[in-house]
Amino acid sequence: QPEQKTLSLTGTYRHVDRTTGQVLTCDKCPAGTYVSEHCTNTSLRVCSSCPSGTFTRHENGIERCHDCSQPCPRPMIERLPCAALTDRECICPPGMYQSNGTCAPHTVCPVGWGVRKKGTENEDVRCKQCARGTFSDVPSSVMKCRAHTDCLGQNLMVVKQGTKETDNVCGVHLSSSSTTPSSPGIATFSHPEHTESHDVPSSTYEPQGMNSTDSNSTASVRTKVPSDIQEETVPDNTSSTSGKESTNRTLPNPPQLTHQQGPHHRHILKLLPSSMEATGEKSSTAIKAPKRGHPRQNPHKHFDINEH
């Protein structure tokens, strides 16, 4: 019924009985219900439960419950279901963010770049080029640039200087090492895990896309490739780097170096005799599901004073 809605004391609302023209003060109905009959001079208001597909979030004096928002469009997922007390809330699945009303995959920061700001379901990842003394050797939407291993601090020597894309390679001084194997031609090198905190991935990295909840999702992982030194200036139309690739690195001496490097494992690098073949495979690097916030997707635009 048409009513002039005026602010009233909590728990009551003003109702105009249109048959008589009288302005009445009625008790509100609880959240999850609506006013099926307004009060009169002689009777209390009557409340009824919101039918399926509708809701009221607060105590109210409205004559019908609000319709719930439409089912979540793919690839969005429900954060809150449609229920008598709550509207349906849709969010982007882990690894994606809301952009122009749909979900786009979080940008993958390429090798040599790290995450400056984590992505959320509402915001894309922001990448930055790894600064001097840091590196990122895997394309990732969650990994930050990591500090080069401090060889000297480990009483080791730098065998190979790290870059933006590779870590330092440390080696033991053969003359001073007490762990040098007795076999000739073998020297032991160490790649201790650095102590800087970083995201520990929770799912396997897949270069072709995300672990989406929607198998029909056409979203693909976008890799940011630097176009200049500044952060966030990289186009996203290049294909992603393979997540599994051989990283056989050769030292100045002929023996091959097996460098099984993962951001969350401790690895020892060893020089092997040249007669032995090394087939180092990069351990799978994972994507961490972003933390979920509480966005209101498709909020109801109407505002009813009788509902507050």
Partner: antibody, heavy 113, light 107 residues
Framework: QVQLQQSGPEVARPGASVKLSCKAS????????LNWVKQRTGQGLEWIGE????????YYNEKFKGKATLTADNSSSTAYLQFSSLTSEDSAVYFC??????WGQGTLVTVSV | DILMTQSPSSMSVSLGDTVSITCHAS??????IGWLQQKPGKSFKGLIY???TLEDGVPSRFTGSGSGADFSLTISSLESEDFADYYC?????????FGGGTKLEIK
């Protein structure tokens, strides 16, 4: 007993204004909305608008905005309808009503040269 | 605006007959409809409100029914004082709108 007593018939020239009154009795004037309705022969009934004397809040039918003005005088429990820039289209019987149940007897307005 | 379509526009009936007048709303109005009676040269009298509730002092031969968009007023055992014009009015939404009226005449 609720009563709505309306003013007598009006004859007016085109372009002029008229102000009709509706005196309420038998209830608390400031507790109820009062409506005004236009009835033209062969044209049916049209709702003009309403006023709540309790706070002078008014609500108009879009069609009558700028044409009709609703006011109320609480001291005399009287509501008023003023019609401006009269044309022959405004010739009609005007009713004040409390809700849809209680009606005044109507006021005939004739616009003629 | 909600359009109220009332039918018939007129009907000739005899004393003691039972008649029904219908009103169709162009959209659902729940039960926010009233029925009015107007005698020639006179004002209006409210008969029914909230679709089915009889106003005080109105004879029980008047009954209202319907909800949503289709409503009717039934007058049973017509008496001479019942010959008049009848209108429906919706008050679910501004502006209030009225049916075109039904003229009840003696056959």
């Amino acid at each position: 007993q609720v009563q709505l007593q309306q003013s007598g018939p009006e004859v007016a020239r085109p372009g002029a204004s008229v102000k009709l009154s509706c005196k309420a009795s038998g209830y608390t004037f400031t507790d109820y909305y009062l409506n005004w309705v236009k009835q033209r022969t062969g044209q049916g009934l049209e709702w003009i608008g309403e006023i709540y004397p309790g706070n002078n809040h008014t609500y108009y039918n879009e069609k009558f905005k700028g044409k009709a003005t609703l006011t109320a005088d609480n001291s005399s429990s009287t509501a008023y309808l003023q019609f401006s820039s009269l044309t022959s289209e405004d010739s009609a019987v005007y009713f004040c009503t409390r809700g849809v149940i209680k009606w005044g007897q109507g006021t005939l307005v004739t616009v003629s040269v | 605006d909600i359009l109220m379509t009332q039918s018939p526009s007129s009907m000739s009936v005899s004393l003691g007959d039972t008649v029904s007048i219908t009103c169709h709303a162009s959209q659902g109005i729940r039960n926010s409809i009233g029925w009015l009676q107007q005698k020639p040269g006179k004002s209006f009298k409210g008969l029914i409100y909230h679709a089915t509730t009889l106003e005080d002092g109105v004879p029980s031969r008047f009954t209202g029914s319907g909800s949503g968009a289709d409503f009717s007023l039934t007058i049973s055992s017509l008496e001479s004082e019942d010959f008049a014009d009848y209108y429906c009015v919706q008050y679910a939404q501004f502006p209030y709108t009225f049916g075109g009226g039904t003229k009840l005449e003696i056959k």
